[in-house]
């Protein structure tokens, strides 16, 4: 039993480290392998994830991580029983995937104005929670051309545009993501989309 | 929001030895070290120690070793630290502090006299 | 404890800018990270900087901090008169043990 592509991981900065690596052939993660996870701090102890299956010779393990800060540092055993696989470090402040945010809401009693509010998905006392930018993705469900990036570039966490940019009459979704340039993350994943019926007066014409 | 409390003002003789708490509420108990520093009146800041409440394990400054100890009951949230063999220098606010590399809240301070 | 210096006193009027210099060795600041403390007459400490330059929510960003080489920076610009306290520095070093030392501590005065 080999490594065939060694564990790359991916931290929320908050309580989880993603890590996923395949094997050399097909294998049942969660009972022939073992992913052990020790923050290189005084007094720190080693937790064990138990890695699930992903895809045939594909392993992810979901590693739980208390008070993620910039100065931290993982050691990271892969065994398989008693032989130890491979052996690397993690540094979550360099591999950051921030969490999506929730609870995406469009608002369409503003008199022609769309108003789409979205939870920022970290708590205050969070480095993250003040540093977050959002990408929020608007499309047609009739027009797939009909497809619209606005950057959020401000804190807060909203957006508002016209009505009147976007057809009246049809129905529309849109969803929301976020990262944070002072660790340079990548991007979340996408919100769950949400959905409206865009109708708007329009304008009388002469 | 966080709250560290800690016990009230203490009087001891020289020889004798304290036990100072500091109650936590407001996060995960467990899934934050726990510090201890004293401040002797009018001088600055000093670390005597640190404590991690998941497992109880602990690291004491060199100049403490052998008269410190530091415990917690994660039952009621609390860490204890109990300086031994007292002497008129330990008098100071000690203080309880929460944090990792450095300490993000404090307790309110538990000023320890040690007077004959 | 390694020893962290600081300036005994500073002192500037009210809007003015001061900043508070914490020195150490290599082992400590230059191969950590620096926290910076506020402690208001009377009260407890209370942390204003950490990682070198990040502010904890409801820090205001007329406080910051900088770290180069064994030498970090506390600024403090728009002085006000609730500024006035002790302020002390802190890291932590793991040579040849673990332990977290504080910087001499610096009284500012705002005149």
């Known amino acids: 039993m080999k490594v065939l592509q060694e564990p790359t991981c991916v931290s929320d900065y908050m309580s989880i480290s993603t890590c996923e690596w395949k094997m050399n052939g097909p294998t049942n993660c969660s009972t022939e392998l073992r992913l052990l996870y020790q923050l290189v701090f005084l007094l720190s102890e080693a937790h064990t994830c138990i890695p699930e299956n992903n895809g045939g010779a594909g392993c992810v393990c979901h590693l739980l991580m208390d008070d993620v800060v910039s100065a931290d540092n993982y050691t990271l055993d892969l065994w398989a029983g008693q032989q130890l696989l491979w052996k690397g470090s993690f540094k979550p402040s360099e591999h950051v995937k921030p969490r999506a945010p929730g609870n995406l809401t469009v608002h369409t009693n503003v008199s022609d104005t769309l108003l789409l509010t979205w939870s920022n998905p970290y708590p205050p006392d969070n480095y993250l929670y003040n540093h977050l930018t959002y990408a929020v993705n608007i499309w047609s469900e009739n027009d797939p051309a009909d497809f619209r990036i606005y950057n959020v570039t401000y804190l807060e966490p909203s957006l508002r545009i016209a009505a009147s940019t976007l057809k009246s009459g049809i129905s529309y979704r849109a969803r929301v993501r976020a990262w944070a340039q002072c660790y340079n993350t990548t991007w979340s994943e996408w919100s769950p989309s949400t959905k409206w019926h865009n109708s708007y007066r329009e304008p009388f014409e002469q | 929001q966080v709250q560290l409390v800690q016990s009230g003002a203490e009087v001891k003789k020289p020889g004798a030895s304290v036990k100072v708490s500091c109650k936590a509420s407001?996060?995960?108990?467990?899934?934050?070290?726990m510090h201890w520093a004293r401040q002797a009146p009018g001088q600055g800041l000093e670390w005597m120690g640190i404590?991690?409440?998941?497992?109880?394990?602990?690291s004491y400054a060199q100049k403490f070793q052998g008269r410190v100890t530091m415990t917690r009951d994660t039952s009621t949230s609390t860490v204890y630290m109990e300086l031994s063999s007292l002497r008129s220098e330990d008098t100071a606010v000690y203080y309880c502090?929460?944090?990792?590399?450095?300490?993000?809240?404090w307790g309110n301070g538990t000023l320890v006299t040690v007077s004959s | 404890l390694p020893v962290l210096t600081q300036p005994p006193s500073v002192s500037a009027a009210p809007g003015q800018k001061v900043t508070i210099s914490c020195s150490g060795g290599?082992?400590?600041?230059?191969?950590?990270?620096v926290s910076w403390y506020q402690q208001l007459p009377g009260a407890a400490p209370k942390l204003l900087i950490y990682?070198?330059?990040k502010r904890p929510s409801g820090i205001p960003d007329r406080f910051s901090g900088f770290r180069s080489g064994t030498s970090a920076t506390l600024a403090i610009t728009g002085l006000q008169t609730g500024d006035e306290a002790d302020y002390y520095c802190?890291?932590?070093?793991?040579?040849?043990?673990?332990?977290?030392?504080f910087g001499t501590g610096t009284k500012l005065t705002v005149l």
């Open positions: 404590i991690n409440p998941s497992g109880g394990s602990t």
């Open positions: 407001g996060y995960a108990f467990t899934s934050y070290y």
């Open positions: 802190g890291t932590w070093d793991t040579s040849p043990v673990w332990e977290w030392p």
């Open positions: 502090a929460r944090g990792k590399y450095w300490m993000y809240d």
């Open positions: 990682d070198n330059n």
């Open positions: 290599s082992s400590s600041i230059g191969n950590s990270y």
